[in-house]
Each structure stands twice: as structure tokens, then as C-alpha cells.
């Protein structure tokens, strides 16, 4: 029986050229996570697996930090990054958890919903 | 116990192509991730490739454009095309898998591939 939830930062703003942090916690489960997937809309940004440690697409790799924890860090913002991010938590042996981050990037500074989470 | 066998490996000229499978085989379950790894001797593992339950892949940037993974879930099969095949190519070529009803990947046995100049 699946009894956790994924709690993420839901909405979230940040400015064109700046940095953010995707982050979902999972929580009220003491089920094993065996793999965490970033995804965004139809495209696999990162993987990160227990045994094998985080890999990163090439497509991505010059603006994709993992971390920290499970999280996924997104550097030099452009407005084509505005979208649905969606962290696919894979556990053992509960199964699998989705928590969905929408991420908005302006190109002014009113990004003031997202500043709990942007890197300065 | 689930097992992975990997086939399709051998020997080839530079520049051919080879396909290799990977099948689950024993009290398969669904998997999350299924991916290709290879080790050339005196070399560490190299990642290469992974496909996701929804079909969402993610290749090495050493094998991006020559190589490509598919999976037939179905079957519990996990291929990889790999064309324009190099001498550096050559290593042993192993499977992995994250099932759903696992704590760990589990690993195929490998097979040989051999590129010739």
C-alpha cells in the first residue's frame, strides 16, 4: 500500500539567466527509493539511480547540476525552459511517486515566487 | 531471480553495426530503468545508455548519434543499435536493469564485442 506523498515547490518563478532549484521531498513512507527521474514534458532531463549515481543527458549537461539531495539544479535560465518539470520517484516497495513542478522563467526580476529557491 | 542475458555481440569491421538484445528471463516483474554498459580491459565501466518505462532515453555523449537503445517491454528486452562501430568500441558490453519489486539494479553476464581496423 502506497501511504507517502510528494510535497515540491510547486509553482515557482525565476529570472532569464539565473539558476534555479527543482526539489520534491518524499515523505510518510519508510519505503526505499531505488531511483528518482527528472523529466520535462516529453524529455529525460536526469536519472538519478541508487546503485548507479546520477546521470545526467548530454543535451542538458552544461546547464544541469545534480542536487542537492534528490533535486535537480537548472543554471542559465532561458525563457524556453518555462514548463512542466515532473520528479518520478521509483521506491521499493511501495512503487512509484510523481510530484509535478511548473516552472516559470521572466525576463524581468519579478521572480519574487521562486526566490526561496534560486541560487544567488 | 531474475536474470539478464545479453546476445548479439562478436566480432565486426570497423564501421559495421552490430545489434545487441537483453532479456529478462525468470519471475520477471515491470522495470523503471534498463540500461547498456561496457568495459574495455584495463578500463573502468562506462555508461552508455538508458531507457525508461516510458521510453524516455538518455545516451553518453561518447555513443550519441551512433548508438541507439529501444526496448520491447512486452518481451523484456532492451536493445542497442550501435552503427559506425570503432575499434575503441571494443569491450565487453553489459545490461542492467531497475525492477520495479527490487532493491538493486541487476546485471547481465556481458558480451564480447570486437571492432577490427
Known amino acids: 500500500m502506497m501511504t507517502g506523498t510528494i510535497e515540491t515547490t510547486g509553482n515557482i518563478s525565476a529570472e532569464k539567466g539565473g539558476s534555479i532549484i527543482l526539489q520534491c521531498h518524499l515523505s510518510s513512507t519508510t519505503a526505499q527509493v531505488t531511483q528518482v527521474n527528472w523529466e520535462q514534458q516529453d524529455q529525460l532531463l536526469a536519472i538519478c539511480n541508487a546503485d548507479l549515481g546520477w546521470h545526467i543527458s548530454p543535451s542538458f549537461k552544461d546547464r544541469v547540476a545534480p542536487g542537492p539531495g534528490l533535486g535537480l539544479t537548472l543554471q542559465s535560465l532561458t525563457v524556453n525552459d518555462t514548463g512542466e518539470y515532473f520528479c518520478i520517484y521509483h521506491t521499493y516497495p511501495d512503487g512509484t511517486y510523481t510530484g509535478r513542478i511548473f516552472l516559470e522563467v521572466l525576463e524581468s526580476s519579478v521572480a519574487e515566487h521562486g526566490a526561496r529557491f534560486q541560487i544567488p | 531471480e531474475v536474470q539478464l542475458v545479453e546476445s548479439g555481440g562478436g566480432l565486426v569491421q570497423a564501421g559495421g553495426s552490430l545489434r545487441l538484445s537483453c532479456a529478462a528471463s525468470?519471475?520477471?516483474?515491470?522495470?523503471?530503468?534498463m540500461g547498456w554498459f561496457r568495459q574495455a580491459p584495463g578500463k573502468e565501466r562506462e555508461f552508455l545508455a538508458i531507457?525508461?518505462?516510458?521510453?524516455?532515453?538518455l545516451y553518453a555523449d561518447s555513443v550519441k548519434g551512433r548508438f541507439t537503445i529501444s526496448a520491447d517491454n512486452a518481451k523484456n528486452t532492451v536493445y542497442l543499435q550501435m552503427n559506425s562501430l570503432k575499434p575503441e568500441d571494443t569491450a565487453v558490453y553489459y545490461c542492467?536493469?531497475?525492477?520495479?519489486?527490487?532493491?538493486?539494479?541487476?546485471w547481465g553476464q556481458g558480451t564480447q564485442v570486437t571492432v577490427s581496423s
Open positions: 525468470g519471475p520477471t516483474f515491470s522495470w523503471t530503468m
Open positions: 531507457i525508461t518505462d516510458g521510453s524516455k532515453t
Open positions: 542492467a536493469a531497475q525492477f520495479t519489486l527490487a532493491r538493486h539494479l541487476v
